[in-house]
């Protein structure tokens, strides 16, 4: 082609028209084009209808094109990936009718201030949605209802002050949630539902530690090993979980998971008032509970965690184990850190290893090239995640360009993955990192393999194992510019359980007393 570079790889015909100072779609492109790169041009406005002749088009990169308007007309029946990051869009086009097969949508780093009701209607195949770096203050109720297959959601670096209580309802495959660097002060009760969320990025928000935060505290404790800090330029493999990164804004950066909740209403003699009644549509069967677990089976008793009552307010083992400073650097928009796929039942990790064909393009902002999906611990045969199909472990798209490192840097201070629970009011034998046991379970962290027979292991939650798990790896998707939920090698660090809606959770985590 006279203007663009055409290459054929296997059955894909890739056309690279990046950085050609184009103001419109070049004429006479090959009709069987499957991947089209139009990044870093000067399109300003673009009509998807102009691509209708390209009936095999599966990936379209329109990032960094100074787009202020995207006209959605016609239909691109097989387009699966659309990158609109780093443009000037002030509203999200209604893509459902035009792009019914869309699986990855990246609208990061635009100028979105709000999303309309039904913004995602018709996008029933969507698996990854990247909205990082916009100016969103609120989200419409039911925003994600049309996207039940969603696996990765990045809302990082916006101005969100609150989240709809049912935002995640029905998202049984969600394995990566990036909410860092917003203005969130609390999490609605039951927000996370009953599924294990393998990778959660929650730091950089002004969490208000009062009685309303107890549900979130319990959730953090239950999911301590699934909470990470995003850092640009750090290989996902180097990431470790750091539940202490979620800090009270009103208490000198005290970790939310250790907030004592003294004086808060209790149910009976203990426990928060938000019991089961707040459980959002729990999947009691657990068909789709995601749980990241490293699969090394430990002795049954796995020495009681030293934490005994792990949450004792005074105990700081978790904190000490985790990096204290957690402000991640800017995420590179295109870092392709791959996240370990969510563990699926039988540890068949379906990490859809969808590597975006979209080749990371070096754009004005260099973004790390996608690294290979981070090794995922081998799934434990028994563990099932409630339905987590590993979602592609791809860096969150269009995070701000970061150096090529695809995996987020470890939190400011890499927190050792404390395998041994910190002692709590009642010291339980601190299980030092459990020894891997023969029973394969999803090995999320390199050291700890949960011998979870069916524990749902988050796709990447415990990807602490440095050795790639064949299953996981095979299932991983590498997504360029993922907010980079780094290939979180979930180093089990926080041994805190966060219980969300857990009726049993006593509000005063501060002092977990032995049962």
């Amino acid at each position: 082609h006279p203007i663009c570079e055409v290459s054929k790889v296997a059955s894909h015909l890739e056309v690279n028209c990046d950085k050609r100072n184009l103001t419109a779609l070049p004429p006479d492109l090959p009709k069987d084009t499957t991947i089209l790169h139009l990044s870093e041009n000067l399109l300003y406005t673009f009509s998807l209808a102009t691509l209708m002749p390209y009936t095999r088009l599966t990936q379209l990169n329109l990032d960094r094109c100074e787009l202020t308007k995207l006209q959605v007309d016609g239909t691109l029946p097989v387009l699966g990936t659309l990158d609109l990051s780093h443009n000037q869009l002030q509203s999200l086009p209604l893509l459902g009718q035009t792009l019914p097969a869309l699986t990855v949508l990246d609208v990061s780093f635009n100028r979105l201030t709000s999303l309309p009701l039904g913004a995602l209607r018709g996008l029933g195949e969507l698996q990854e949605l990247y909205l990082k770096g916009n100016e969103l203050k609120t989200l419409p109720p039911g925003l994600l209802t049309p996207t039940p297959k969603l696996e990765k959601l990045s809302l990082a670096n916006n101005n969100l002050t609150e989240l709809p209580a049912g935002l995640l309802n029905g998202l049984e495959n969600l394995d990566t949630l990036l909410l860092q660097e917003n203005s969130l002060y609390t999490i609605p009760k039951g927000f996370f539902g009953s599924h294990l969320l393998p990778f959660a990025f929650l730091h950089g928000n002004p969490w208000l530690c009062n009685c309303e935060i107890l549900y979130f505290r319990r959730w953090l404790q239950d999911n301590a090993e699934n909470v990470y800090v995003w850092k640009q330029g750090v290989d996902v493999k180097a990431m470790t979980s750091n539940v202490a990164s979620v800090q009270c804004d009103n208490s000198d950066k005290f970790p939310v998971y250790k907030y004592p909740g003294k004086g808060c209403p209790t149910l009976g003699d203990e426990g928060d008032t938000d019991l089961y009644d707040y459980y959002p549509e729990e999947d009691t069967e657990g068909d789709k509970v995601r749980a990241t677990r490293t699969v090394v089976k430990f002795p049954t008793k796995a020495h009681t965690t030293p934490w005994g009552l792990f949450y004792s307010w005074s105990t700081a083992s978790l904190d000490s184990q985790m990096p204290s400073s957690l402000h991640p650097t800017q995420e590179s928009t295109k870092e392709q850190t791959t996240f370990p796929p969510r563990w699926t039942p039988n540890f068949t990790l379906h990490m859809e290893s969808i590597t975006f064909s979209k080749t990371p393009k070096s754009t004005t902002e260099p973004t790390p090239s996608p690294t290979t999906s981070e090794p995922v611990p081998e799934p434990a045969p028994n563990m099932t995640t409630l339905e987590p199909t590993p979602s592609p472990t791809t860096p969150e798209p269009t995070s701000e360009p970061a150096p090529s490192p695809t995996t987020p840097e470890p939190t400011s201070e890499p927190a050792p993955s404390p395998t041994t629970p910190e002692p709590t009011s009642e010291p339980a034998p601190s299980p030092t990192t459990p020894e891997p046991t023969p029973i394969p379970t999803i090995a999320t962290s390199p050291t700890i393999l949960v011998s979870a027979t069916s524990l749902i292991t988050p796709k990447s939650t415990f990807l602490t194992t440095t050795k790639p798990v064949s299953l996981l790896e095979s299932t991983k998707k590498t997504i360029p510019e993922l907010d980079q939920p780094p290939k979180l090698r979930g180093v089990l660090q926080g041994h805190l359980e966060s219980s969300r809606n857990d009726p049993f959770l006593h509000p005063d985590f501060c002092c977990l007393l032995p049962l």
Epitope: F192, N223, E497
Partner: nanobody, 123 residues
Framework: EVQLVESGGGLVQAGGSLRLSCAAS????????MGWFRQAPGKERESVTA???????LYADSMKGRITISRDNAKNTVYLQMNSLTPDDTAVYYC?????????????????EGQGTQVTVSS
């Protein structure tokens, strides 16, 4: 010392159901991840299910879709409903409590565990 007492086990025919209960002696029950593991004769222990303080739930693949865990903090009790039982489900079922995370529980890092209740599924 926390005491965990299981009940509800017994002999059932293949395809049948059982509901196991685990009563805890302390009111601090809500501070723990609770769940069940099992051990069949000549086999290693395996995690069956767990429920966190916040309601996060994990199930083993081998019993996925056939079991449901729930807890009643007011009664300091956790329940395991098992349906469509097969002879392979024959084992001693133990209740356990962990003050750590869900992952720790799944790794069998328990603070407390009960004496177990026998479940026998005949063909």
């Amino acid at each position: 010392e926390v005491q965990l007492v299981e009940s509800g086990g017994g002999l059932v025919q293949a395809g049948g159901s059982l509901r196991l209960s685990c009563a805890a002696s302390r009111r601090t029950f809500s501070n723990y991840v609770m769940g069940w593991f099992r051990q069949a004769p000549g086999k290693e222990r395996e995690s069956v299910t767990a429920i966190g303080r916040s309601g996060t739930i994990l199930y083993a693949d081998s019993m996925k879709g056939r079991i449901t865990i729930s807890r009643d903090n007011a009664k300091n009790t956790v329940y395991l409903q098992m349906n469509s039982l097969t002879p392979d489900d024959t084992a001693v079922y133990y209740c356990a409590a962990s003050s750590g995370s869900m992952q720790q529980f799944w790794r069998m890092e328990y603070d407390y565990e009960g004496q177990g209740t026998q479940v026998t599924v005949s063909s």
